[in-house]
Interface confidence: low
């Protein structure tokens, strides 16, 4: 169903797990706890997730709604260029760096700003919705 | 490093309004929501509602919904709470606090030293 | 509204003792838990966020934790400063609620 590709399109897919919230076609995990960014990604990978990886300024803007000032790592890096962890590159929208040493992407409810890995932050995983909800 | 201010004690009148402030500083006001707790005497904590001081955009606990009103005044970086038609049941220490975080999952790492509110003749 | 069951609701203990507060929600709250230490003069402060995330600054003595629907504080070795009112808040949904406070004396 849509339990192929972390990144596929989940169109007709139906309800989340728990603790998950859906919005349009995908589920999202807003998280309690802080990590860094390494220990977000496998927190999402661990629950056949991603780190946020944002298609368009349209899913953007639904997210941000749901954000306050504070950021929260997403996946997206600073390898050469700011890419998704998907591999496809940042280019519906900017961000925000004030070092070189800022290598990890975070999202607030103002945009996209650059931080240190390694600052524990809160986080938001992705994925698609499962038919099954009493897999998690 | 982060203050929250407010003033020691308000002696008011029953039936009369009452606006309490909390004054912050070491931090960026408009990024955090402040949210209110009431305490009687000897009693537990409520939590009254919150404010965001970006847009002032409000979540009250419909139990202080005809009580508190929550406004901010963002030039002094200043949040306040008044409560209107004071009877003794109102009679309590008002904390201010802040929030951190999304808004959906809020705690209080920042606390004022609260305002204790007597109601009496 | 989300009830919070908070026992017990006051423990005498001696310095140095380890002790367990429990608050139990009424329905899931998703561990999204908080307590605080309230001071005798009314001062507050986040001890854990998120069930069992310790604040800054807090002491490692503290420590948080959560089986099913309770949710516990334990101190594994009591200080003198630690003798204060304790409070769990859940802030998983609106209104935000508090358990009603643990009262922790010397004995």
């Known amino acids: 169903l849509c339990q192929g590709s972390n990144y596929s399109t989940c169109a007709s897919c139906p309800s989340c797990p728990d603790r998950w919230m859906k919005y349009g076609n995908h589920c999202y995990y807003f998280s309690v706890e802080e990590k860094d960014w390494n220990s977000s990604l496998e927190f999402c990978l661990a629950r056949d997730s991603h780190l946020l990886v944002i298609t368009d300024n349209q899913e953007m803007s639904l997210l941000q709604v749901f954000l306050s000032e504070a950021f929260c790592w997403i996946g997206l890096r600073n390898n050469s260029g700011w890419r998704w962890e998907d591999g496809s590159p940042l280019n519906f929208s900017r961000i925000s760096s004030n070092s070189f040493v800022q290598t990890c992407g975070a999202i607030n409810k103002n945009g996209l700003q650059a931080s240190s890995c390694e600052v524990p932050l809160h986080w938001v995983c992705k994925k698609c919705p499962f038919a099954d909800q009493a897999l998690f | 490093q982060v203050q929250l201010q407010q003033p020691g004690a308000e002696m008011v009148r029953p039936g009369a309004s009452v606006k309490l402030s909390c004054k912050t500083s070491?931090?960026?006001?408009?990024?955090?929501?402040m949210h209110w707790v009431k305490q009687r005497p000897g009693q537990g904590l409520e939590w009254i509602g919150k404010?965001?001081?970006?847009?002032?955009?409000?979540h009250y606990n419909q139990k202080f919904k005809d009580k508190a009103t929550l406004t901010v005044d963002k030039s002094s970086s200043t949040a306040y709470i008044q409560l209107n038609s004071l009877t003794s049941e109102d009679s309590a220490v008002y904390y201010c606090?802040?929030?951190?975080?999304?808004?959906?999952?809020?705690?209080?790492?920042?606390w004022g030293q609260g305002t204790l509110v007597t109601v009496s003749a | 509204d989300i009830q919070m069951t908070q026992s017990p609701s006051s423990l005498s203990a001696s310095l140095g003792e380890r002790i367990s507060l429990t608050c139990r929600a009424s329905?899931?709250?998703?561990?999204?838990l908080n307590w605080f230490q309230q001071k005798p003069d009314g001062t507050i402060k986040l001890l854990i966020y998120?069930?069992?995330s310790l604040d800054s600054g807090v002491p490692k003595r503290f420590s948080g934790s959560r089986s099913g629907s309770d949710y516990s504080l334990t101190i594994s070795s009591l200080e003198s400063e630690d003798f204060a009112d304790y409070y769990c808040?859940?802030?998983?949904?609106?209104?935000?609620?508090f358990g009603a406070g643990t009262k922790l004396e010397l004995k």
């Open positions: 606090a802040r929030g951190r975080l999304l808004r959906l999952r809020d705690w209080f790492p920042y």
């Open positions: 808040l859940q802030y998983a949904s609106f209104p935000l609620t």
């Open positions: 404010i965001d001081p970006s847009d002032s955009e409000t």
């Open positions: 329905q899931d709250i998703y561990g999204s």
């Open positions: 998120g069930t069992s």
């Open positions: 070491g931090y960026t006001f408009t990024s955090y929501w």
